[in-house]
């Protein structure tokens, strides 16, 4: 009986034509959100004045339907057990699931001028700028709409420059007809235990912005894990929004709508700095910030977004060191809504339900030459938004669940 | 891609003064800023000073500040080094360039003109 469980397992989560894997594979039957929460400042002129606390108040949910497109360009390779894809990019606006619209206001920290004066530490080239920032009538923090803090607004201190640069600027431009990857990933037919497990990204199997093994592209990406999986595993996979990887631990027992699943989360510990995890001293890139990496729950993926200074962390700086949140006033980190959680069907290795969560941040530092800046006397990471990215199996594909899969094991 | 040729240097006596022009052909000249280098025989190429594109504003070596000036004229696709009080030690080959900020930022310019010979002697 097992045996011939195990064997039409390993044949259904083969990612090939004809199998339950690929059908929900190439275009997930999951409906996923994703929740923004904006930080609004509420008191910049103090913060620009006098370097005080940032005071922050989230404002959310602001939720849009995501990863509903297809896979494209879905190839087979049979000389080395592969299949190759693109993950389209698309984001749908969800008033009924938001508490306003997109073309609410926000305080938030200026992008262009924070990156700007963070890429550009020549003394002749801060003058410059503070003269186009001053020209511009820009300053410190700024007043934008969800719109365009997400997707791209102009940015009229860098229109002012007279030869062509990117002059739109956004936390996630561009998105909308973009797409993530190529991912080449293991099929599985060959060794089942390899199934959906990265082979390369972008056509590397480094990522080329880390030291290491700290630079390596691990495991799968998340939708699904390798069958039969085990409470005692460590559950490697890559995040390109995050631009690394990182791993989820057993936690605890779930029930999900009549099937037992395995709750694991990202832990702590993978959020540690070098002193307590010796195994993250490649992902401390810079001794200042960091405090001679001593900081944790930050992560600095400058070199992932060419150069801006941006900052990951899990939402209200969740596992973060005390100096990371003091500048900043206003956030409440709690585990159960700020954690990263994966529900995974051990028998399939399916991953029926996952929270991810992450906080953008972005880094301004005092400059001498760039008057908007001049009075700050420290560092400041600044929250921009957080988001929760979520998906549960449906109770339609939860029942076909229960009736093939966990139903004939019990 | 701005192509650039300097003129103007020659022998001087300490304390005396020299203008240095720079002759830029390209369409690009007047959207970047633009600067003046000098390299000493046996030492590396140093910065000396620079100007945007406007002229607005204008940022020189502390070795030179006070007694050179920089200026251009994007009408005529100029740019000038006026040195007043020199020294011994500003001889060297004088080299102008520009380039968009990046280039600044990093001291990477993609190609050097010929240069113009400033000896400074008695």
């Known amino acids: 009986g097992d045996l011939l469980i195990q064997k039409t397992i390993k044949k259904q989560v083969v990612l090939e034509e004809g199998t339950i894997a690929f059908k929900n594979w190439v275009k997930t039957g999951t409906e996923v959100y994703r929740q923004f929460w904006i930080f609004d400042v509420q008191n910049p002129q103090e913060v620009m004045m006098n370097s005080s606390n940032i005071q922050v108040k989230q404002r959310g949910p602001y939720t849009y339907r995501v990863r509903f497109l297809a896979k494209e360009n879905v190839t087979q390779d049979a000389e080395d057990n592969t299949v190759s894809f693109l993950q389209p990019n698309g984001a749908i606006f969800e008033p009924s699931l938001s508490v306003g619209t997109e073309a609410d206001n926000f305080t938030v920290l200026n992008l262009a001028v924070a990156a700007a004066s963070h890429i550009y530490q020549n003394q002749f080239v801060q003058m410059i700028l503070n003269s186009l920032i001053n020209k511009s009538k820009s300053s410190m923090f700024q007043v934008r709409t969800l719109r365009e803090l997400l997707w791209g607004y102009r940015d009229p201190f860098l229109s002012l420059v007279p030869y062509p640069v990117t002059t739109t600027v956004g936390l996630f431009y561009p998105y909308n007809n973009t797409a993530d990857g190529v991912y080449k990933v293991f099929n599985g037919k060959d060794n089942i235990s390899k199934v959906a497990i990265i082979d390369t990204y972008k056509g590397k199997r480094n990522l080329s912005y880390w030291e290491s093994h700290c630079d390596m592209i691990n495991g799968t990406d998340a939708a699904s894990f390798p069958p039969f999986v085990e409470k005692s595993q460590v559950l490697q996979f890559f995040s390109s929004d995050i631009c690394r990887s990182i791993y989820a631990v057993f936690e605890s027992d779930v029930n999900l709508k009549g099937i037992p699943v395995y709750r694991f989360v990202l832990p702590s510990k993978a959020f540690a700095s070098p002193v307590e995890n010796p195994d993250n001293y490649c992902f401390c890139t810079e001794k200042i910030i960091s405090k001679n990496c001593t900081s944790y729950g930050v992560l600095d993926i400058s070199k992932c977004k060419e150069g801006r200074p941006v900052y990951i962390s899990l939402p209200h700086f969740l596992y973060a060191s005390p100096d990371v949140s003091e500048p900043i006033d206003g956030l409440n980190p709690n585990e159960e809504e700020h954690r990263t959680y994966l529900d995974i069907e051990p028998i399939t290795g399916f991953t029926l339900q996952f929270a991810k969560r992450l906080q953008v941040n972005l880094l301004v530092k005092p400059s001498e030459k760039i008057q908007v800046l001049k009075n700050l006397k420290r560092n400041y990471i600044v929250p921009i938004l957080w988001l929760n990215e979520t998906g549960t199996i449906g109770d339609e594909k939860a029942n076909m669940f229960r009736s093939q899969v966990t139903g004939k094991i019990n | 891609q701005v192509q650039l040729q300097e003129s103007g240097g020659g022998l001087v006596q300490p304390g005396g003064s020299l203008r240095l022009s720079c002759a830029a052909s390209?369409?690009?000249?007047?959207?970047?800023?633009m600067g003046w280098f000098r390299q000493a025989p046996g030492k590396e190429r140093e910065f000396v000073a620079a100007?945007?594109?406007?002229?607005?504003?204008?940022y020189y070596a502390d070795s030179v500040k006070g007694r050179f000036a920089i200026s251009r004229d994007n009408a005529k696709n100029m740019v000038y080094l006026q040195m007043n009080s020199l020294k011994p030690e500003d001889t060297a080959v004088y080299y102008c360039?520009?380039?968009?900020?990046?280039?600044?930022?990093?001291?990477?310019?993609?190609?050097w003109g010929q240069g113009t010979q400033v000896t400074v002697s008695s």
């Open positions: 360039n520009a380039g968009p900020l990046d280039s600044w930022e990093r001291n990477d310019f993609p190609s």
């Open positions: 390209g369409r690009t000249f007047s959207s970047y800023p």
């Open positions: 100007i945007d594109w406007s002229g607005d504003i204008t």
